[in-house]
Interface confidence: low
């Protein structure tokens, strides 16, 4: 049935899907607070621009009876059930904000005739790449992959004089939603990462990972994993590690590394942490005071989704253009808008660009220090610390092939 959009005559509605199955186990109340805070800002910005319009959000809840795993495993059906709910109510907003699970977003995109934009806080998987009306406000797997390939190929920095072409990937199936899809992308045989590497093996058991740390016959010195320092410690403990081993710990949505009083534990000395550049400051707002760093990023993405809608609404209204058109649905890309915590840039496919930061542990200070940054928008690495106090020999990253250390 044809669903009418509540999106004209000075009244503009946002449909927010409040799904029990979510990329992060975040109380829906916090997401509501984030959306409402975003609405306040949008209303103010529109008012300041002389646009006397109404902007509201409708929260669409699933019944939670059937789809109650709480993670993304049963999200496909939950997403479609919510769309059915919208269809039955014959009422849809100008924009759909909500599905964060890759499964649900992919299926909803397939099963709907999307003449409206869909904004996601999540949908990290490669299957959600290049969707014409989908915008993703948390770094998708493709961005991580491009960084890794760029870094592997780099060989002209004082601290990295070898190109790498090999890697182990540790993936045991217990990962969080973001990590699951990041590692899934690295594992996929058809992905850019796999295509560019000569050797890549996925380690699925704790023992496999632990054995590699001191295995003289290992095929690569580099191991990629995803999670926080505690996750690594559970796996690695205080085991000895060969001096040429480099562990790349992907922990994008965690800004604890940048806090002044943080000291890196000893087990992190062989580790390079890949994270996102922290916001202008740690958030201190009504919706985020009690959130962990990851949840803060998730709630922030919801809030930024509202601000993005406000940004596009303002542009279209100022130009006298219709909101319920394919042009509007396809416009949420290739732009920069004023986000809650700084400017937010979306690439040509509506995916958020960011500055990734690679950290190392200084053997002198036991602090995390920035080794380099990477701008996903221009796919470029910027070295920061030209003389890092590494644990590795000669303060240089080793070759990725055992037995050919720094020369």
């Amino acid at each position: 049935s044809q669903v009418s959009q509540n999106c004209h005559n000075g009244s503009y509605e946002i449909s927010v899907l409040m799904m029990g199955n979510s990329a992060f186990a975040e109380p829906l109340k916090n997401l509501e607070d984030a959306v409402n805070e975003g609405l306040e800002i949008v209303r103010g910005r529109l008012q300041n621009a002389g646009l006397n319009v109404t902007v509201n959000a409708t929260f669409m809840y699933s019944d939670g009876l059937i789809h109650n795993s709480g993670d993304c495993r049963s999200s496909t059906c939950e997403g479609l059930d919510l769309l059915r709910k919208i269809s039955n109510a014959q009422r849809m907003g100008c924009v759909l904000i909500g599905p964060s699970c890759t499964y649900s977003t992919f299926q909803m995109y397939l099963d709907t005739e999307l003449s409206y934009p869909m904004i996601s806080a999540g949908s990290f998987g490669l299957s959600c790449d290049y969707k014409e009306t989908l915008t993703r406000l948390m770094s998708p797997a493709r961005k991580l992959m491009y960084f890794l390939v760029n870094f592997w190929k780099t060989n002209d920095l004082p601290f990295k004089t070898y190109s790498w072409s090999t890697s182990y990937v540790y993936k045991n199936g217990t990962e969080t939603e973001d990590c699951f899809w990041y590692l899934n992308a690295l594992e996929a045989s058809v992905s850019y990462f796999s295509h560019e590497l000569g050797f890549k093996v996925v380690l699925r058991q704790d023992k496999e990972f632990q054995d590699i740390l001191m295995d003289h016959n290992r095929k690569s010195n580099v191991i990629i994993m995803c999670g926080g320092p505690e996750f690594l410690y559970k796996l690695k403990g205080d085991r000895a590690v060969a001096e040429d081993i480099v562990i790349i710990l992907v922990d994008l949505f965690n800004d604890q590394y940048f806090e002044d009083n943080v000291t890196a534990p000893d087990y992190m000395k062989n580790v390079l942490v890949l994270t996102l550049s922290p916001g202008n400051s740690l958030l201190n707002s009504s919706f985020s005071r009690n959130l962990s760093p990851t949840k803060r990023d998730f709630a922030l993405a919801y809030l930024n989704g509202i601000l993005l809608f406000g940004h596009m609404l303002k542009i279209f209204l100022e130009n006298g253009e219709n909101i319920t058109t394919p042009k509007f649905a396809h416009a949420f890309r290739n732009l920069t808008f004023e986000g809650y915590d700084g400017p937010v840039t979306l690439d040509d496919w509506g995916d958020v660009d960011s500055t990734m930061v690679l950290l190392y542990t200084s053997v002198d200070t036991k602090k995390y220090k920035v080794l380099l940054t990477y701008d996903t928008h221009v796919n470029k690495t910027y070295p920061v610390d030209m003389s890092p106090t590494f644990t590795w020999k000669n303060s240089k990253l080793p070759n990725d092939i055992t037995g050919r250390g720094p020369q």
């Epitope: 306040e40 800002i41 910005r45 300041n48 920069t336 004023e338 400017p343």
Partner: antibody
Framework: QVQLQESGPGLVKPSETLSLTCTVS????????WSWIRQPAGKGLEWIGR???????SYNPSLKSRVTVSVDTSKNQFSLKLSSVTAADTAVYYC???????????WGQGTLVTVSS | EIVLTQSPGTLSLSPGERATLSCRAS???????LAWYQQKPGQAPRLLIY???SRATGIPDRFSGSGSGTDFTLTISRLEPEDFAVYYC??????????FGQGTKLEIK
């Protein structure tokens, strides 16, 4: 029309704290970022720091240890405090609306603060 | 830290002439985050150009901006008497969050 007006003492003694207030009219202080920028006589511009909703701030690293920017939404004002001042902090101080995508579209007229005993 | 270097330090031209002011960054700057300002003696800076090439409200079309990466240019196609002032470029997005060039003084020849 958006207008910004700086106010505060024009003379501060060395080692004391410089305090300035910017009063905003024509725009709600809650809906934008707001920055402080200074300019020593005959020299270039230096960004000091910014504030946004709920008092969230970011500062120029070179001044971070001495700077506090705060906001009073009820008065539509934001303020600057710079502690332990020296003669090098003598400058014209401007408040400005910060559009985040990299530019300042409205500025106050500036206020000269001299640090001298 | 990104350092912006403007050249020339002083530019002497006559009304009616074309002025080309340069701003070079020590590392790449996103074109979304580069702006130009005009400042006259005793006045606050005035925004001319933002996002490298977008003119601010009320700025005449003789002012234009261009560039990408590390090299940016402000062009005044035909100088008017009121255009003689100091011009600053400014970037956002790298630590410190925001920085300005040292300025180019445009004076009457």
């Amino acid at each position: 029309q958006v207008q910004l007006q700086e106010s505060g003492p024009g003379l501060v003694k060395p080692s004391e704290t410089l305090s300035l207030t910017c009063t905003v009219s024509g725009a709600s202080i809650s809906h934008y970022y707001w920055s402080w920028i200074r300019q020593p006589a005959g020299k270039g511009l230096e960004w000091i720091g910014r504030i946004y909703i709920s008092g969230r701030t970011s500062y120029n690293p070179s001044l971070k240890s001495r700077v506090t920017v705060s906001v009073d939404t009820s008065k539509n004002q934001f303020s600057l405090k710079l502690s332990s001042v020296t003669a090098a902090d003598t400058a014209v101080y401007y408040c400005a609306r910060d559009r985040l995508t990299g530019y300042f579209d409205y500025w106050g007229q500036g206020t000269l603060v001299t640090v001298s005993s | 830290e990104i350092v912006l270097t403007q050249s020339p330090g002083t530019l002497s031209l006559s009304p009616g002439e074309r002025a080309t002011l340069s701003c070079r960054a020590s590392q790449s700057v996103s074109s979304s985050y580069l702006a130009w300002y005009q400042q006259k003696p005793g006045q606050a800076p005035r925004l001319l150009i933002y996002g490298t090439s977008s003119r601010a409200t009320g700025i005449p079309d003789r002012f234009s901006g261009s560039g990408s990466g590390t090299d940016f240019t402000l062009t005044i196609s035909r100088l008017e008497p009121e255009d003689f002032a100091v011009y600053y470029c400014q970037q956002y997005g790298s630590s410190p969050m925001c920085s300005f060039g040292q300025g180019t003084k445009l004076e009457i020849k």
